[in-house]
Interface confidence: low
């Protein structure tokens, strides 16, 4: 993925399809890479990222990564191709319109990651357990 200052000049709406034939066009995502964050012990947080970019590739989705260790908390916002692992993890929730954080096992830190495929969906990251994909209302939103 190219950096946001380059990406801002990209003006291309090429489209690809997913495995089900659903049409995909370049996503608009928050793209601040890694920034320090004050997001902690909250049901949801805003990214506080002021950079919106059109993703370089049509198949890319929005991703947010929240990490906490003994020293600091960071939030990473990027575009990424869901066919490829990110931080060694598969983007299993890439079809979701909302960025629902899921904890991943990483030694020495608390690590949450989410991905989603609606415009700027990684601006609002959701930790609350009430937003999981067993919620029929959320499934309705995803597949309508």
């Amino acid at each position: 993925t190219i950096p946001p200052h380059v990406q801002k000049s990209v003006n291309n709406d090429m489209i690809v399809t997913d495995n089900n034939g659903a049409v995909k066009f370049p996503q608009l995502c928050k793209f601040c890479d890694v920034r320090f964050s004050t997001c902690d012990n909250q049901k949801s947080c805003m990214s506080n990222c002021s950079i919106t970019s059109i993703c370089e590739k049509p198949q890319e989705v929005c991703v947010a990564v929240w990490r906490k260790n003994d020293e600091n908390i960071t939030l990473e916002t990027v575009c990424h191709d869901p066919k490829l692992p990110y931080h060694d993890f598969i983007l299993e929730d890439a079809a979701s319109p909302k960025c629902i954080m899921k904890e991943k096992k990483k030694p020495g830190e608390t690590f949450f990651m989410c991905s989603c495929s609606s415009d700027e969906c990684n601006d609002n990251i959701i930790f609350s357990e009430e937003y999981n994909t067993s919620n029929p209302d959320l499934l309705l939103v995803i597949f309508q």
Epitope: N12, L28, T52, D119, E120
Partner: antibody, heavy 122, light 107 residues
Framework: EVQLVESGGGLVQPGGSLRLSCAAS????????MTWVRQAPGKGLEWVSV????????YYADSVKGRFTISRDNSKNTLYLQMNSLRAEDTAVYYC???????????????WGQGTLVTVSS | DIQMTQSPSSLSASVGDRVTITCRAS??????LNWYQQKPGKAPKLLIY???SLQSGVPSRFSGSGSGTDFTLTISSLQPEDFATYYC?????????FGQGTKVEIK
Amino acid sequence: EVQLVESGGGLVQPGGSLRLSCAASGFDFDIYAMTWVRQAPGKGLEWVSVISGSGGTTYYADSVKGRFTISRDNSKNTLYLQMNSLRAEDTAVYYCARRSQYRDKVGATDYWGQGTLVTVSS
Amino acid sequence: DIQMTQSPSSLSASVGDRVTITCRASQSISSYLNWYQQKPGKAPKLLIYAASSLQSGVPSRFSGSGSGTDFTLTISSLQPEDFATYYCQQSYSTPPTFGQGTKVEIK
């Protein structure tokens, strides 16, 4: 119910300026990219501009680039189009429209306002 | 820019007729095409997206097909409320250009 209501159109001289507004209701305005599309009298549709939900990203048709500015105020659920250095060929009905948020809609504009007429004439 | 050409530019038909409108792109756009209906003095309304998917609330007599450069909008049995102008639009590249429109009139 999704509603988009444009205002601000009118008669303006060539070289003049006008600011269009589009008041949105019935949906979460700040998560949708919004577009302006225009239609000259008796002619077809022409895409003008798009702005992302946060306002962080904008794109323009070549015909208006450098003269028009799209913006939004999410606290007021309002979309704007600032039109400067207006020309006779900018005369049209201007529609604001919501870009579908979901990828299977191909970025189609799924809801439109009723339009506001801009006439550029001396 | 990708050019979109619709044909015919106008047609006359009767209630109950089967109506077909075609749209041709100047280059391949895969299946990335939308159809809109516009009535006089009104805003356009999305009918079909992704060449063949019916927008919610649109009657099933409307259907779309095609891929690559050639696309078709079909109204299986024309109703009085269907007399309008129809536009195709490609979403393959910026700017998302429209066809010039096809006016469906009462015979």
